[in-house]
């Protein structure tokens, strides 16, 4: 079952005063140990730690003359990063991506820009989500899943790619954003934080949560990921924070129960199908929408990302599975793999709920800073 | 039910060489980090050596590198540890161990290496 | 390496009394910290893992806390069967280290 925490009236992390400055989003300071691309997160002496290996997505798709038309994914190339303190007696540590792919990881070098110069980019993922100053836009309709209920048979394969835990969608799983904002899923994964350290990827008022999951979809309107990329509204991202609750989370238990089978990085094993819509919060209606980038190289603009208002719950014992039990490069632990929230550059976030709502009963009039953008232009 | 079974042990002169075997079952050990870990008698317990689910990364303690090599088997469900140059010093139980996010989870019930003229 | 330092050695209380160990790491290891405890003449049972939590089937009067150097391992309410060597380990990176070991007995 799923034990989303229900949010009716107040948005995700609370209200806020809010000035009347979009630009004073860039870069609300959050967690102290948030690691950027050129500042590793470091803290105490954890040996490794501070080359913690990353991340997500990168849907990178096969030349059609190997696959026609295939919506194949393949996993974004490994990241470096030294061993542990104690150099391992031998490294027969496979790269299964070849020495000719680009190298990247959270903290240190190389910096991101010179792995993919779009992650300099303006507009880029993911950042801090300030509610009050969002702008309400009731054209956002609620989002609609289409066949993600998946059976037992076919199983899907759960990968440590090295940067997070990836799990390849079947084709069928239809989305959509509004009328015409058709897409489809490819995969999901998930971004965590560390030893009772929150590692979501977005944050609330500079609240960061313990972890988030990303299901990384396909616009209808391309055949192929790398058609896509950089493309506005070519790639969509479902978003929602993880939160602690009291229950396990059987939905998730599916998923973390494996985790053991693929501690290693490169390893993978194949998992029953499952209902993917019920990794997510059940409110499809309340969440916010703007327009920014991969969070990892190749960093590609362009991506519509959706965050949930509501949370999905997990229990203690199922989030210290996800961040303790996964290896990556160099035998580092894979842990804290999220990038530091980016500027707005003048980006607004729409809502779809009139989430600058200050909930208080001496609220007579709602304070809305930003002006909705039509949905879907 | 988790099973961890050593083997191998036994009376063995200063410079010479011994081989443990540690057999696993109830859990699929072609996933799971495997230890060795030792205890002298009366004394308390120390790390000796770590090897990847893969055998991708392996690690020793001080005391023993360059003297001991640990290895698995994952068709056969076995961890190895070669044992060369014994000492005195190395007369402990052994211990097979496995690794997961809740450290040292299962221990086998040990085996005892005595090195000794 | 990272060091453990457990301390004390040994220590000798009453059944009911609430007993403290504890364990220092000589550099920060988040909350890598396992607790176990020994029994004479048998194999290591782990008690905690993660500084806190407990493994299923322990008794509720062994709790553990701390994390970054200091760590505790707290038994509530000392009972005879509670009598063994107790380790820390720490378990972040190679090579794991255990600490030199607690010796409870009953008074």
């Known amino acids: 079952q799923r034990l989303p925490r229900m949010q009716e009236d107040s948005p995700l992390g609370g209200g806020s005063s809010g000035e009347d400055d979009p630009l004073g989003e860039e870069d609300l300071p959050s967690e102290e140990d948030s690691p950027r691309e050129e500042d590793p997160p470091g803290e105490e002496d954890l040996p490794g730690e501070e080359d913690l290996p990353g991340e997500e997505d990168l849907p990178e798709v096969k030349p059609k003359s190997e696959e026609e038309g295939s919506l194949k994914l393949e996993d974004l190339p490994t990241v470096e990063a030294p061993g542990d303190p104690q150099e391992p007696q031998n490294n027969a540590h496979r790269d299964k991506e070849g020495d000719d792919q680009s190298h990247w990881r959270y903290g240190g070098d190389p910096p991101w820009p010179r792995v993919s110069p779009a992650c300099a980019g303006r507009f880029q993922s993911p950042v801090d989500i300030r509610p009050q100053l969002a702008a309400f836009c009731p054209a956002l309709r609620p989002l609609e899943l289409l066949g993600f209920q998946l059976p037992p048979l076919p199983e899907l394969r759960l990968r440590n790619n090295g940067h997070s835990v990836q799990l390849t969608l079947p084709p069928g799983l239809e989305m959509a954003l509004g009328p015409g904002r058709e897409y489809r899923a490819l995969q999901l994964h998930l971004h965590w934080g560390a030893a009772g350290r929150p590692g979501s990827e977005h944050t609330v008022e500079g609240h960061r949560f313990p972890a988030e999951i990303h299901v990384v979809h396909l616009s209808t309107a391309f055949a192929r990921v790398d058609e896509a990329l950089g493309r506005p509204g070519g790639l969509a991202v479902l978003a929602a924070f993880l939160e602690e609750g009291p229950e396990e989370n059987s939905a998730y238990e599916q998923l973390l129960s494996r985790l053991e089978e693929i501690a290693e990085e490169g390893s993978e094993t194949q998992v029953p199908g499952l209902d993917i819509s019920a990794l997510l919060p059940s409110d499809f209606s309340r969440y916010f929408q703007y327009e920014g980038s991969l969070t990892t190289p190749p960093c590609a603009q362009g991506v519509i990302w959706t965050v949930f208002n509501q949370t999905v719950m997990l229990s203690a014992k199922q989030l210290h599975t996800l961040s303790d039990t996964l290896w990556g490069p160099g035998d580092s632990r894979l842990q804290l793999n999220f990038r530091a929230t980016q500027p707005l550059n003048g980006r607004v976030i729409e809502a779809s709920f009139p989430a600058g709502v200050d909930s208080s009963p001496r609220a007579a009039e709602p304070v809305q800073l930003n002006s909705c953008l039509a949905a879907g232009d | 039910e988790v099973q961890l079974v050593e083997f191998g042990g036994g009376l063995v002169k200063p410079g010479g060489s011994l081989r443990l075997s540690c057999a696993a079952s109830?859990?699929?050990?072609?996933?799971?980090?495997m230890n060795w870990v030792r205890q002298a008698p009366g004394e308390g317990l120390e790390w000796v050596s770590s090897i990847t689910s893969s055998s991708s990364y392996i690690y020793y303690a001080d005391s023993v590198k360059g003297r001991f090599t640990i290895s698995r088997d994952n068709a056969k469900n076995s961890l190895y540890l070669q044992m060369n140059s014994l000492r005195a010093e190395d007369t402990a139980v052994y211990y097979c161990?496995?690794?997961?996010?809740?450290?040292?989870?299962?221990w086998g019930q040990g085996t005892l290496v005595t090195v000794s003229s | 390496d990272i060091q453990m330092t457990q301390s004390p050695s040994s220590l000798s209380a009453s059944v009911g009394d609430r007993v403290t160990i504890t364990c220092r790491a000589s550099?920060?290891?988040?909350?890598?910290l396992a607790w176990y405890q020994q029994k004479p003449g048998k194999v290591p049972k782990l008690l905690i893992y993660?500084?806190?939590t407990l493994q299923s089937g322990v008794p509720s009067r062994f709790s553990g806390s701390g994390s970054g150097t200091d760590f505790t391992l707290t038994i509530s309410s000392l009972q005879p069967e509670d009598v063994a060597v107790y380790y820390c380990?720490?378990?972040?990176?190679?090579?794991?280290?255990f600490g030199q070991g607690t010796k409870v007995e009953i008074k």
């Open positions: 161990a496995r690794f997961t996010a809740m450290a040292l989870d299962y």
């Open positions: 550099q920060g290891i988040f909350n890598y």
């Open positions: 109830g859990f699929t050990f072609s996933s799971f980090r």
């Open positions: 993660a500084a806190s």
């Open positions: 380990l720490k378990y972040n990176s190679a090579p794991w280290t």
